[in-house]
Interface confidence: medium
């Protein structure tokens, strides 16, 4: 018969001859023969192949480095890779998470419009007229400046985007 | 020979405060997370701290958080541990250990001798 | 917070073989790490990432961990292993330790 030019799925063309791949989880260790089937062998510790294969020798799992910011988010099996995620305070500096970076703090003056995630950083907002923040801070919105009418008292101090307002007492002289 | 030397350990009063040093060799510090781990009188491990190689990124258990605080200088090849407030729940062995790195995955594979602090009146 | 649960003793004959566990919740999504400390002496390292033997360590150390449980286990117990045994995960920017299992060897 004429050696095929193709071979079905899970199956690769060597020497005029289909041969099994190996399934996810093991590598090759011999091609097969006229007399004898792909041989293959599971991957060690630390490894894996996640296809159909013929590769001879299988991937190293990720490494989700402590040194920057990475934590295992999902362990590694003989067919899968680690996946890795950023510790608490830190976020992914790419969408490969291969590093992360500490979640940004928003200066006095300056509140956060929206929390950091673990993808994310910190988005800070200027503090409008009527709100300040003096801390720096992953976490604090602007707080509006306390209203001194309301505790009958006057404005002593005029607030600005870093400080309250000081109330005082009304000046009981004035008529 | 790797190796991790604890000092600084001694009696302290409530409220004290005590800096202890870890001096490494061997290895490149450098390129290692470090950690404290104490043990109370006839009590198990407790873990204290750990920070990353460069100094980035610290980490306190709950109990500590606050009062103490973990630094490194890679050119003295030194770990330290600045405790203020000492409570008398904080007598107890302090070890100092290396992070096992991509070679010892999440584990601590070189411990120090331990240093001994007592907080009393 | 996160803990790590072990049994306070467990005995064993000498030859026979010693299973220690650690449960956590959902332990098994972590790498768990087992030391062996000896009266007045600290901590060693025998396995790491939840079956892996550091260099020095017998082959009668071995390690497991899936679900909420990791087991370590000591085929052959020699005297020379009786000692308190504590199991470690890293679990959302902290280290934990279970309390520690004391090996007798009968």
């Known amino acids: 018969p004429e050696p095929p030019t193709a071979c079905r799925e899970k199956q690769y063309l060597i020497n005029s001859q289909c041969c099994s791949l190996c399934q996810p989880g093991q590598k090759l260790v011999s091609d097969c023969t006229e007399f004898t089937e792909t041989e293959c062998l599971p991957c060690g510790e630390s490894e894996f192949l996640d296809t159909w294969n013929r590769e001879t020798h299988c991937h190293q799992h990720k490494y989700c480095d402590p040194n920057l910011g990475l934590r295992v988010q999902q362990k590694g099996t003989s067919e899968t890779d680690t996946i890795c995620t950023c510790e608490e305070g830190w976020h992914c500096t790419s969408e490969a998470c291969e590093s992360c970076v500490l979640h940004r703090s928003c200066s006095p003056g300056f509140g956060v419009k929206q929390i950091a995630t673990g993808v994310s950083d910190t988005i800070c907002e200027p503090c409008p007229v009527g709100f300040f923040s003096n801390v720096s801070s992953a976490f604090e919105k602007c707080h509006p400046w306390t209203s001194c009418e309301t505790k009958d008292l006057v404005v002593q101090q005029a607030g600005t985007n870093k400080t309250d307002v000081v109330c005082g007492p009304q000046d009981r002289l004035r008529a | 020979e790797v190796q991790l030397v604890e000092s600084g350990g001694g009696l302290v009063q409530p409220g004290g405060s005590l800096r202890l040093s870890c001096a490494a060799s061997?290895?490149?510090?450098?390129?290692?997370?470090m950690s404290w781990v104490r043990q109370a009188p006839g009590k198990g491990l407790e873990w204290v701290s750990t920070?990353?190689?460069?100094?980035?990124?610290?980490y306190y258990a709950d109990s500590v958080k606050g009062r103490f605080t973990i630094s490194r200088d890679n050119s003295k090849n030194t770990l330290y541990l600045q405790m203020n407030s000492l409570r008398a729940e904080d007598t107890a062995v302090y070890y100092c250990a290396k992070e096992g790195g991509k070679y010892y995955y999440y584990a601590m594979d070189v411990w120090g001798q331990g240093t001994t602090v007592t907080v009393s009146s | 917070s996160y803990e790590l649960t072990q049994p306070p003793s467990v005995s064993v004959s000498p030859g026979q073989t010693a299973s220690i566990t650690c449960s956590g919740d959902?332990?098994?999504?972590?790498?768990a790490a087992w030391y062996q400390q000896k009266p007045g002496q600290s901590p060693v390292l025998v396995i790491y990432q939840d079956s892996r033997r550091p260099s020095g360590i017998p082959e009668r150390f071995s390690g497991s961990n899936s679900g909420n449980t990791a087991t370590l286990t000591i085929s052959g117990t020699q005297a020379m292993d009786e000692a308190d045994y504590y199991c470690?995960?890293?679990?959302?920017?902290?280290?934990?330790f279970g309390g520690g299992t004391k090996l007798t060897v009968l």
């Open positions: 920070i990353q190689n460069a100094g980035g990124g610290t």
């Open positions: 470690q995960a890293w679990a959302s920017s902290t280290v934990v």
């Open positions: 061997g290895f490149t510090f450098s390129s290692y997370a």
């Open positions: 959902k332990l098994g999504d972590k790498y």
